[in-house]
């Protein structure tokens, strides 16, 4: 028995930040679980981890250079990524493992979300067009 995961097919990070919501076919209330977000087709880079425990606050962990936070819903975990770079445009996969109560569960691999990071373009403000020729 596997947990199904739904993700948006594509998100655009205009301001170098994005909310990626992982929706599960499973209620996470009062469960001990590990939800993670992985970058790349091979999922080789673990971007962010959210630990849920029925008795403690949510713990969020990231050590791969990503600025990450997490929020828990009844059947979802939302990863909030900030300070993204254009070269971090990639496909991102949600993953989850539920430890307690038994039985142990994990997810079917999702289709992933392509996060397209748009670079910040510095444009001259129309209020201050710069020096004009005399």
């Amino acid at each position: 028995n596997k947990i199904l995961v739904k993700q948006s097919p594509m998100l655009v990070a205009y301001d170098n930040a994005v909310n990626l919501s992982c929706k599960y076919s499973y209620n996470l209330f009062s469960r001990e679980f590990r939800a993670s977000l992985h970058k790349g087709l091979d999922s080789a880079v673990e971007v962010c981890v959210v630990y849920g425990n029925y008795s403690q606050q949510l713990q969020v962990y990231s050590k791969t250079g990503f600025n990450c936070d997490g929020k828990l819903g009844n059947e979802s975990v939302t990863f909030y990524l900030q300070n993204l770079y254009v070269n971090q445009t990639d496909i991102y996969f949600c993953k989850i493992e539920v430890m307690y109560p038994p039985p142990y569960l994990d997810n079917e691999k999702s289709n992933g979300t392509i996060i397209h990071v748009k670079g910040k373009h510095l444009c001259p403000s129309p209020l201050f067009p710069g020096p004009s020729k005399p």
Epitope: R34, E46, V49, Y61, K63, K95, M99
Partner: nanobody, 124 residues
Framework: EVQLVESGGGLVQAGGSLRLSCKAA????????MGWFRQAPGKEREFVAS????????YYEEAVKGRFTISRDNTKNTVYLQMDSLRPEDTAVYYC?????????????????WGQGTQVTVSS
Amino acid sequence: EVQLVESGGGLVQAGGSLRLSCKAAGRTFSSYAMGWFRQAPGKEREFVASIEWDGGGAYYEEAVKGRFTISRDNTKNTVYLQMDSLRPEDTAVYYCAASRWRTALTNYYDVADWGQGTQVTVSS
């Protein structure tokens, strides 16, 4: 609880190779992710590599990618770390770790049990 016994550490010259082994006894070995951490003198223990319960996926610290390879043999309850192109900065005590999870082991929160560690020294 699982008992973990490491072997294969030693002194090697820069550019050389070592193969670490970690034999597990106790808990069902094949049901959990396994991995390696290391601790250099005066530094925190850091993640090196891990492998999923069925060997289906592996994770590596950026600094060791392309040089280190983790593998496991569930019939022998053993996990291996093949270390090639060793550098002086790889000098550390290497610890085997058993995860609480089937597919995940990348940080302290994931570790259920530690081995005693084996010293790896790379001379220049």
